[in-house]
């Protein structure tokens, strides 16, 4: 159980004050108006690996 607002969220997630919880930025596609999505816009998702050299 995370103390409110203390630990930073892992990459690809952002803090929701509304839910008192780190939330997965991927869910912003379905719910773009969630409060944590602003933090997702500021921190782009982890880079993907190319499948070829």
């Amino acid at each position: 159980e995370q103390a409110p607002g203390t630990a930073p969220c892992s990459r690809g997630s952002s803090w929701s004050a509304d839910l008192d919880k780190c939330m997965d930025c991927a869910s912003c596609r379905a719910r773009p108006h969630s409060d944590f999505c602003l933090g997702c816009a500021a921190a782009p998702p982890a880079p993907f690996r190319l499948l070829w050299p």
Partner: antibody, heavy 123, light 111 residues
Amino acid sequence: QVSLKESGPGILQPSQTLSLTCSFSGFSLSTSGMGVSWIRQPSGKGLEWLAHIYWDDDKRYNPSLKSRLTISKDTSRNQVFLKITSVDTADTATYYCARRGPDYYGYYPMDYWGQGTSVTVSA
Amino acid sequence: DIVLTQSPASLAVSLGQRATISCRASKSVSTSSYSYMHWYQQKPGQPPKLLIKYTSNLESGVPARFSGSGSGTDFILNIHPVEEEDAATYYCQHSRELPWTFGGGTKLEIK
């Protein structure tokens, strides 16, 4: 259609442990963003939020009661539980469970509530 | 904890007139983009019913005579025109931080 229903012992004695069950239908607690809260209301008085459990089993408690509260869930049975230890007459109230769930605009406040279960603590 | 103070504690409004209920928070429940304030209606023997979420967004099925406004520490619930079925107790609630707290309630009587 979403519905929630609370059940409890009705009457119990001081120092005992209160066990409450919230049985729900119409949504799944395995859905990302979903959660269930417990709220209580002494007769003729206001509302007090007690605890919340999330789809991923993360839990939150009201600090003023945290040492006495335990919230848990059985996702497969669509049930959420609350235990309050060492009850006193001040715990006499109607206890509600309520859902917080995701929608397009973000996350609902408590949008669906059960009818409540009355609990009396009396010697 | 954020304390929510509602005023008045009770009010009587004539049918068809405007009811205004205030909710003041002990500290801001808003950010630059969000106001985490919600309003509920409770009738005797019933659970609370969500009316307005995030300050001004009407819950589905709630009549348009209900409206909410405000930011920071000061919020308002307006009902206009008031109807008989609006007789109830109204509560504000915030979700800005834990613990989520409710106002003490405002009892609305229809004259």
